[in-house]
């Protein structure tokens, strides 16, 4: 056997080159046949009407033919025949790769609530061979479950991702990325997660700046509530007591002028949206007016989120006392 060919792998729509090579040439005729055993070229003559086949080289030792705009139907065995006695035959297999036609990502719900599990599907249509689908949430790879459907030598792959969403996932892209031998570089599609979550409440003491509250001073607290959707209701209450008469409420701000010891207590900022409620407490302790140099103290604001039980860390501004942790039932 001195007739040689090489297998060819080509991407649909591109050009395949088929070469029939003769090692020891004796001027025998070389013929190229298609998978239906129809003659494509007999020496340098093409009887076949398919003009996508063009002669690249013809000599006694080689018949080289190009096939342009390759389609899936061109796949199969192509036969080189050498008219020696006995005749020799060798075949080359053309494998046609088809990149996925379409990449579609489908998310179960446009908006999810934190803690929910949502289903995300990604479909790579009509590829050959079957596409491998990889999932990423931001930069983190996730595991999906793929199903392959075959139709007419083409494969449609659907990958399902079950994703438990957290508030941190809001605005993070879920990326469906395909790996396929006919695709160079990154072929991907993405959808941004929209996660609704209950408010996170944080109390900021905006006055006094040094954080020590004394009789006769003023107090200004600002309630910062962040949630999705943005909380519509932000309210201040005094826990287990009435709000002081001289307290002024202005949106998220609480002003108390001319502090006195009867103002001592816990002040709560409550915020809610359609997902849920949350609050944060501030424990006010009013000190005596200064006589000499005031002792150094620190005051920290405290934040809680509602679950069945919220642990509130309360740090008192009383000199010499440690902050204590109390369980607060709601």
């Amino acid at each position: 056997q001195n007739l040689f060919t090489k297998d060819v792998t080509v991407i649909e729509g591109e050009v395949a080159t088929i070469s029939c090579q003769v090692n020891k040439s004796d001027d025998s005729v070389i013929q190229l046949l298609n998978p239906n055993r129809q003659t494509i070229y007999f020496r340098d003559f093409r009887p076949l009407k398919d003009s996508r086949f063009q002669l690249l080289n013809f000599s006694s030792s080689e018949l080289k033919v190009s096939l342009t705009n390759v389609s899936i139907s061109d796949e199969g065995r192509y036969f080189c025949q050498l008219y020696t006695d006995p005749p020799q035959e060798s075949y080359t297999t053309i494998t046609v790769l088809v990149p996925p036609r379409n990449l579609m990502i489908d998310i179960q719900r446009d908006t999810a609530v934190e803690g929910e599990e949502i289903e995300v599907n990604c479909t790579a249509m009509a590829s050959k061979p079957a596409t491998t689908i990889r999932w990423f949430k931001g930069n983190t790879e996730l595991k999906g479950k793929s199903e392959v459907e075959e139709w007419s030598d083409m494969y449609t792959v659907t990958s399902q991702l079950m994703l438990k969403v957290h508030k941190e996932d809001d605005g993070v892209p879920v990326i469906c990325q395909v790996e396929h031998p006919a695709v160079t570089g990154n072929l991907q599609t993405q959808r941004y997660l929209e996660v609704q979550y209950k408010p996170q409440v944080h109390i900021q003491m905006t006055y006094p700046l040094q954080g020590l509250t004394r009789e006769g001073d003023a107090l200004e607290l600002t309630c910062e509530a962040i949630g999705k959707p943005q909380p519509v209701m932000v309210t201040w209450v005094r826990v287990d007591d009435e709000m002081p008469q001289h307290a002024v409420l202005s949106g998220p701000n609480l002003f108390i002028n001319n502090l006195n010891k009867t103002d001592n207590g816990t002040y709560r900022c409550e915020a809610s949206n359609i997902v849920g409620k949350a609050h944060s407490d501030y424990m006010l302790y009013v000190y005596d007016p200064p006589t000499t140099i005031p002792p150094p103290t620190t005051t920290t604001t405290t934040t809680t989120t509602t679950t069945t039980t919220i642990l509130t860390i309360i740090t008192d501004s009383r000199a010499g006392e440690e902050g204590s942790i109390r369980a607060v039932d709601h």
Partner: antibody, heavy 119, light 109 residues
Amino acid sequence: EVQLVESGGGLVQPGGSLRLSCAASGFTFRSYTMSWVRQAPGKGLEWVSGISGSGGSTYYADSVKGRFTISRDNSNNTLYLQMHSLRAEDTALYYCARGLYGLYAMDVWGQGTTVTVSR
Amino acid sequence: SSELTQDPAVSVASGQTVRITCQGDSLRHYYPSWYQQKPRQAPVLVFFGENNRPSGIPDRFSGSASGNTASLTIAGAQAEDDADYYCSSRDGNDDRWLFGGGTKVTVLG
């Protein structure tokens, strides 16, 4: 000058045998596929048989398969058609033809030899 | 078995154009060869493949093919073109050759 000359035709009884010859000259005989084509009186052309340049591949029309054998002697530049079990419908003028590209494009033809199958 | 179908006869005035057609399944895949045969003479190859005219054949002979039909056109027919014309093609995927029934072209002078 490229030339093909047929011989061997004649009158033969049904069931009889005959061998046709075609002498080629003026070209490299072994490089070409050769064919036999016949034409019944007043009728059109009918391809009968073909053989590759080396003689390794042979082809036949359904009407003669199993009865006719094509062969060639490249050293003597001669093409043959051995015909057995002849029938009245085999009566025709038999042409020898050179295939320019395999059996495609028969570019050189002989003048033909007549075979008559009759009682 | 496949076959090639030709119109039995066609006539053309001298200097006019005549088109001879050939129909058959094998022509979906292959270009035909066209042969001219004058009375008591051997056939002569006049056109083959996509666009091949053997040397010595006048350029008034041309061929075309589409679908399962092929045509031989004689543009400006001459008296010497009066002859029978046969189309020929490989029979589908088989190593057998077909001839059409022939078309008798009469050039009216």
